[in-house]
Interface confidence: medium
């Protein structure tokens, strides 16, 4: 009995920022849950975590250096990623687990979202660029 997740197939981050909405076939209201966003085909990098507990404030954090925020809807979590680098263009997967009330639930693997980062390169440009080659 798995939760189904829907994501946009592709998003373009024009200004190094993007909103990725994860829509679930499950109502998160009054649940203890952990929603996370993972980078790469193997989901090796946990980009951002949104932890919700019916008795506490929503916790949003990244242990991998991403600048992220999260917003909770009844059946969705939206991850807001900022300061993305062009080389962070990749496929991103939404995951969810519900710990309370029982039974423990998690999701079927989603199709993922390709985030294409087209923004500025976020690296300092030289003040005095060298002479251009003819």
């Amino acid at each position: 009995n798995k939760i189904l997740v829907k994501q946009s197939p592709m998003l373009v981050a024009y200004d190094n920022a993007v909103n990725l909405s994860c829509k679930y076939s499950y109502n998160l209201f009054s649940r203890e849950f952990r929603a996370s966003l993972h980078k790469g085909l193997d989901s090796a990098v946990e980009v951002c975590v949104v932890y919700g507990n019916y008795s506490q404030q929503l916790q949003v954090y990244s242990k991998t250096g991403f600048n992220c925020d999260g917003k909770l809807g009844n059946e969705s979590v939206t991850f807001y990623l900022q300061n993305l680098y062009v080389n962070q263009t990749d496929i991103y997967f939404c995951k969810i687990e519900v710990m309370y009330p029982p039974p423990y639930l998690d999701n079927e693997k989603s199709n993922g979202t390709i985030i294409h980062v087209k923004g500025k390169h976020l690296c300092p440009s030289p003040l005095f660029p060298g002479p251009s080659k003819p």
Epitope: R34, S36, E97, P101, P102, Y104, D106
Partner: nanobody, 118 residues
Framework: VQLVESGGGLVQPGGSLRLSCAAS????????IGWVRRAPGKEEELVAR????????RYADSVKGRFTISADTSKNTAYLQMNSLRAEDTAVYYC????????????WGQGTTVTVSS
């Protein structure tokens, strides 16, 4: 379904113990595993809990920073590392599958006794 605890014993205050909970008949990554302790004259306490494939954890305030719960899904075993033990940690520690806060559980182990005394 079976849960078998081990690792209890007598330890001096400030010492450490590591409890193990070997599960069979179900996959621990498909549920939550909790460590519950019972001591005479005290309320039963869910001291730590770990859930699912991603290993989300939660601790009772009384053990935060001292106890660490973990799981090895390849061995289908959960662990409770107990450091800086105190006399008040003396209890029978039970491993329970799918804790339903705070006092009802689906499956229980037989318990292992932890005694903290000099």
């Amino acid at each position: 379904v079976q849960l078998v605890e081990s690792g209890g014993g007598l330890v001096q205050p400030g010492g450490s113990l590591r409890l193990s909970c070997a599960a069979s008949g179900f996959n621990i990554k498909d549920t939550c595993i909790g460590w519950v302790r019972r001591a005479p004259g005290k309320e039963e306490e869910l001291v730590a809990r770990i859930c699912g494939e991603y290993g989300s954890t939660r601790y009772a305030d009384s053990v935060k920073g001292r106890f660490t719960i973990s799981a090895d899904t390849s061995k289908n075993t959960a662990y409770l590392q107990m450091n800086s033990l105190r006399a008040e940690d003396t209890a029978v520690y039970y491993c329970a599958a799918q804790p339903r806060y705070y006092d009802v559980y689906d499956y229980w182990g037989q318990g292992t006794t932890v005694t903290v005394s000099s």
